[in-house]
Interface confidence: medium
């Protein structure tokens, strides 16, 4: 009986982009200026979301389809649909309450965004800190002590590139 | 520490005009990610937001209910909000607030500080 | 426009009660909606923003929870200090309150 009556209601009909409008019969309707209806059979449109202030629009609102924001530059996005703009810092430092501040002594940010991190301790590998760590980066971890007999290079050199997909010659 | 302290307010006639100014203090109203507005509440009432300026854009928006009768703008220099209010009517009598959107952290879809208010009074 | 509606207009209470106010906005609005507490003859003042995370300064017995368009703010144990009108505010297409709650002394 629910299918039956589905299928003769008038606004089944209305197609994205309009809305049934009882007002007026239950004729399909345009959606309004700023609103829009992402499905058809909708009995009203939603209005859009506007990119203001921090957000920046990236693409506009249709009659079938809402508005998408990201940041104004200085800002990156965060949550699901761009629903924040937080602040960039710079690298070697990390966002507070009271805006950037300088990454701890022990601590690092290589990006613009996210938090300071402590640098990796060598020693829970059995290795030693070949490269000291900045506030910009992490420390580099090179052989153990015992590996670095007299006269042992302490620097291993690199294995060799090998693109994705290909197989060594 | 952030301060927005608001003047101009005062006893006006219906048709008349009045210019609200808001002078800020503790942050700068062009820095992008931070919107001013003005945000109004008649006595006894609930609170209506009236109009706001983006900070680096400077994109102005407007309720409905003031639309073509109110200005807002923002002189940079002296880092002062204006609200021109003109073609008042007598149920444009309301306190007037200024308020800062949000911070610079997030969305700024939000007033974290507010001045204490301007009464203007449209009344023949 | 967006309405937003708060219930109950008014609620009388005593101290140590725990209170709750709702929102709920005419469509979705995740999760850009702010709670504001004002006493008379003052500004408002933020207590929450982005639905559920406390401006600086406010105390923990304040919460807000809800997405889409149903949204509560909660006080765990009224205080004496805590007697005001509550508003909601939505910024996700301009900015619109919801008509406030007024908590009284019961």
């Known amino acids: 009986f629910e299918r039956t009556r589905s299928l003769q209601d008038p606004c089944s009909n209305c197609p994205a982009g309009t809305f049934c409008d009882n007002n007026r019969n239950q004729i399909c309707s345009p959606c309004p200026p700023n609103s829009f209806s992402s499905a058809g059979g909708q009995r009203t449109c939603d209005i859009c979301r506007q990119c203001k202030g921090v957000f920046r629009t990236r693409k506009e609102c249709s009659s079938t389809s809402n508005a998408e924001c990201d940041c104004t530059p200085g800002f990156h996005c965060l949550g699901a649909g761009c629903s924040m703009c937080e602040q960039d810092c710079k690298q070697g430092q990390e966002l507070t309450k009271k805006g950037c501040k300088d990454c701890c002594f022990g601590t690092f940010n290589d990006q613009k965004r996210g938090i300071c991190r402590p640098w990796t301790n060598c020693s829970l590998d059995g290795k030693s800190v070949l490269v000291n760590g900045t506030k910009e980066r992490d420390v580099v971890c090179g052989p153990s002590p015992a590996d670095l007999s007299p006269g042992a290079s302490s620097v291993t050199p690199p294995a060799p590139a090998r693109e994705p997909g290909h197989s060594p010659q | 520490e952030v301060q927005l302290v608001e003047s101009g307010g005062g006893l006006v006639q219906p048709g008349g005009s009045l210019r609200l100014s808001c002078a800020a203090s503790?942050?700068?109203?062009?820095?992008?990610?931070?919107?001013v507005a003005w945000i109004r509440q008649a006595p006894g009432k609930g609170l209506e937001w009236v109009s706001s300026?983006?900070?680096?854009?400077?994109?102005?928006y407007y309720a409905d209910s003031v639309k073509g009768r109110f200005t807002i703008s923002r002189d940079n220099s002296k880092n002062t909000l204006y609200l021109q209010l003109n073609s008042l009517r007598a149920e444009d009598t309301a306190v007037y607030y200024c308020?800062?959107?949000?911070?610079?952290?997030?969305?700024?879809?939000?007033?974290?500080?507010w001045g204490q208010g301007t009464l203007v009074t449209v009344s023949s | 426009d967006i309405q937003l509606t708060q219930s109950p207009s008014s609620l009388s209470a005593s101290v140590g009660d725990r209170v709750t106010i709702t929102c709920r906005a005419s469509?979705?609005?995740?999760?850009?909606l702010a709670w504001y507490q004002q006493k008379p003859g003052k500004a408002p003042k933020l207590l929450i923003y982005?639905?559920?995370n406390r401006a600086t300064g406010i105390p923990s017995r304040f919460s807000g929870s809800g997405s889409g368009t149903d949204f509560t703010l909660t006080i765990s144990s009224l205080q004496p200090e805590d007697f005001a009108t509550y508003y909601c505010?939505?910024?996700?297409?301009?900015?619109?309150f919801g008509q406030g709650t007024k908590v009284e002394i019961k």
């Open positions: 308020a800062r959107g949000g911070s610079t952290a997030v969305t700024g879809d939000w007033f974290d500080y």
């Open positions: 503790g942050f700068s109203l062009s820095t992008s990610g931070v919107g």
């Open positions: 300026i983006s900070g680096a854009g400077g994109t102005t």
């Open positions: 469509q979705g609005i995740s999760p850009y």
């Open positions: 982005d639905a559920s």
């Open positions: 505010q939505q910024g996700y297409s301009l900015w619109t």
